[in-house]
């Protein structure tokens, strides 16, 4: 029997601050060009070495960013989404949902490891 | 790897004309934001305009804003810089530069491109 893949969603503040790299990171996502089927939010899709957030080493590619300084990114078009992000500052808070994998063993399953109870 | 190659620099009056080309390869031109700086003996480099990865969306300092276009022909991979009402402080080194589509930062933050030309003089008498 195969294993079960879930998913841990967490949120996090992540407070930046650009530097000569800027934030160093990219985004797709928009109610114009959905990144995840059925969800107009904005995802991280690339971290650019040497940039804030790649120095900071919270945010990952893959996050969902659900506001900048407090202003919520729902429904949003993609160019005003970056137009956002590009206005926002020197000083930039992100609230940011992170999705790790986490892969569940088959039912009954007991490790070899696994105590025998 | 992508390679950016300028041209159409050169000398000119005070008043005048230039275009500068900038020809892209190796790479998936319409997935770039294209940018143009410039750098001035003893000058810090300095931003002069650029343009989204689909032509859509353009910005520029106030020093060249009304005197200076940048556009692109995503067809022939090339952004091209239309400077007009040319001043001796215009005079300078200009370089191309591009970096992946839909960044966060403001164009103006050199440290954000990925790719750089080596240059075309620019000298206005």
């Known amino acids: 029997m195969n294993g079960r893949v879930d998913y841990l969603v967490t949120e996090e503040e992540i407070n930046l601050t650009r530097g000569p790299s800027g934030l160093g990171f990219n985004i797709v996502g928009g109610t114009d060009q959905q990144y995840v089927s059925n969800d107009s939010g904005i995802y991280v899709s690339r971290i650019k070495e040497n940039g804030a957030a790649a120095l900071d080493g919270r945010l990952q590619e893959g996050d969902k960013i659900l506001s900048v300084n407090g202003q919520d990114l729902k429904n949003l078009l993609h160019q005003d989404a970056v137009d956002l992000f590009r206005n926002a500052g020197y000083a930039v808070s992100l609230r940011v949902q992170h999705r790790l994998q986490v892969q569940n063993g088959p039912i009954g399953h007991r490790g070899e490891g696994d105590p025998s109870g | 790897e992508v390679q950016l190659v300028e041209s159409g620099g050169g000398l000119v009056q005070a008043g005048g004309s230039l275009r500068l080309s900038c020809v892209a390869s190796?790479?998936?031109?319409?997935?770039?934001?294209m940018g143009w700086f410039r750098q001035a003996p003893g000058k810090e480099r300095e931003f002069v305009a650029a343009?989204?990865?689909?032509?859509?969306?353009?910005d520029y300092p106030d020093s060249v804003k009304g005197r200076f276009t940048i556009s692109r022909d995503n067809a022939k991979n090339t952004v091209y810089l239309q400077m007009n009402g040319l001043k001796p402080e215009d005079t300078a080194v200009y370089y191309c530069?591009?970096?992946?589509?839909?960044?966060?930062?403001?164009?103006?933050?050199?440290?954000?491109?990925?790719?750089w030309g080596q240059g075309t003089q620019v000298t206005v008498s």
């Open positions: 190796g790479g998936t031109f319409s997935s770039y934001d």
């Open positions: 343009i989204n990865w689909s032509g859509g969306s353009t």
């Open positions: 530069a591009s970096r992946w589509r839909s960044g966060v930062d403001p164009y103006y933050y050199a440290g954000t491109y990925d790719y």
